[in-house]
């Protein structure tokens, strides 16, 4: 079974800068899975942000504009990355990755 690790416990960024979060997949080939990213803002329910499927197709939360969150995967390091562009106060949250084994 696949296992996920998010090595960064926290990330502090200056407003308008870029934040890059990592999710390391082990126990399964990342190219054979779909990785999902969610966020939980203080006092709010968890929210789906974006996913990247085994074939590379990206799907995002339709209510969030393109260009805000960028998801990628690096097979060589078995890592999925979530890049948050132009960091703002409403991006303060806990971000989670999740795995869907195909």
């Amino acid at each position: 079974a696949g296992h996920l690790e998010q090595p960064q416990i926290s990330s502090t960024k200056t407003l308008s800068k870029t934040a890059r979060l990592e999710c390391v997949v082990s126990g399964i080939t990342i190219s054979a899975t779909s990785v999902y990213w969610y966020r939980e803002r203080p006092g709010e329910v968890i929210q789906f942000l974006v996913s990247i499927s085994y074939d590379g197709t990206v799907r995002k939360e339709s209510g969030i504009p393109s260009g805000k969150f960028e998801v990628d995967r690096i097979p060589e390091t078995s890592t999925s990355t979530l890049t948050i562009h132009n960091v703002e106060k409403q991006d303060i949250a806990t971000y989670y990755c999740a795995l869907w084994e195909v």
Epitope: E61, S66, E70, D72, H85
Partner: antibody, heavy 118, light 108 residues
Framework: EVQLVESGGGLVKPGGSLRLSCAAS????????LTWVRQAPGKGLEWVSS????????FYADSVKGRFTISRDNAKNSLYLQMNSLRAEDTAVYYC???????????WGQGTTVTVSS | EIVMTQSPGTLSLSPGERATLSCRAS???????LAWFQQKPGQAPRRLIY???SRATGIPDRFSGSGSGTDFTLTISRLEPEDFAVYYC?????????FGGGTKVEIK
């Protein structure tokens, strides 16, 4: 069927203002982020602005920042673009478009023409 | 800002021929965030391809996209009369979203 209908274009003098509207139907308007894109006469496409479903995220192209304001009214299924301090280089056809789960510009309106001239 | 450059500016071909349109990004773009659009005179653009290679709903399979990094290609395997139009590439991985300058495919 998804429909986007822009209105509000017209002729305006440099320094003037105009408010564009985009009336939407055929989809869950309040769940989608939306965009404005423009096309100057005989030129290519230029992204202008985007707004999230709840209006919490708003982005602008540098060329319009501080002059244009994007907004939406989910109760009226409408998107707006308030354009102030208009310049000749803002002359273009303005399109509204959806920004769905598979990326932006999946559905487009027919466009409304803005001409800035003295 | 990621600058998208398309070539050639104009492509003169006959119906039935193969069209190959190029798009180059000024910095690396994830292939998941590259789209192609078609625009005919007096009409709004229409999305053909998203994610560099996935066809949008209702797009014929003679249209195909490929590429990664900074170099992307749109191929029309056999040009039909209705395919003569202007084509734009666009990246949507990061704001500002940027379009290429377009390639006009005209009848030879």
């Amino acid at each position: 069927e998804v429909q986007l209908v822009e209105s509000g274009g017209g002729l305006v003098k440099p320094g003037g203002s105009l408010r564009l509207s985009c009336a939407a139907s055929g989809f869950a308007f309040s769940s989608y982020s939306l965009t404005w894109v423009r096309q100057a006469p005989g030129k290519g496409l230029e992204w202008v602005s985007s707004i999230s479903s709840s209006s919490s995220y708003i982005f602008y192209a540098d060329s319009v920042k501080g002059r244009f304001t994007i907004s939406r009214d989910n109760a009226k299924n409408s998107l707006y673009l308030q354009m102030n301090s208009l310049r000749a280089e803002d002359t273009a056809v303005y399109y509204c478009a959806t920004d769905g789960e598979l990326g932006p510009f999946d559905y487009w309106g027919q466009g409304t023409t803005v001409t800035v001239s003295s | 800002e990621i600058v998208m450059t398309q070539s050639p500016g104009t492509l003169s071909l006959s119906p039935g021929e193969r069209a190959t349109l190029s798009c180059r990004a000024s910095q690396s773009v994830s292939s998941s965030y590259l789209a192609w659009f078609q625009q005919k005179p007096g009409q709004a653009p229409r999305r053909l391809i998203y994610g560099a290679s996935s066809r949008a709903t209702g797009i014929p399979d003679r249209f195909s996209g490929s590429g990664s990094g900074t170099d992307f290609t749109l191929t029309i395997s056999r040009l039909e009369p209705e395919d003569f139009a202007v084509y734009y590439c666009q990246q949507y991985g990061r704001s500002p979203l940027t379009f290429g300058g377009g390639t006009k495919v005209e009848i030879k």
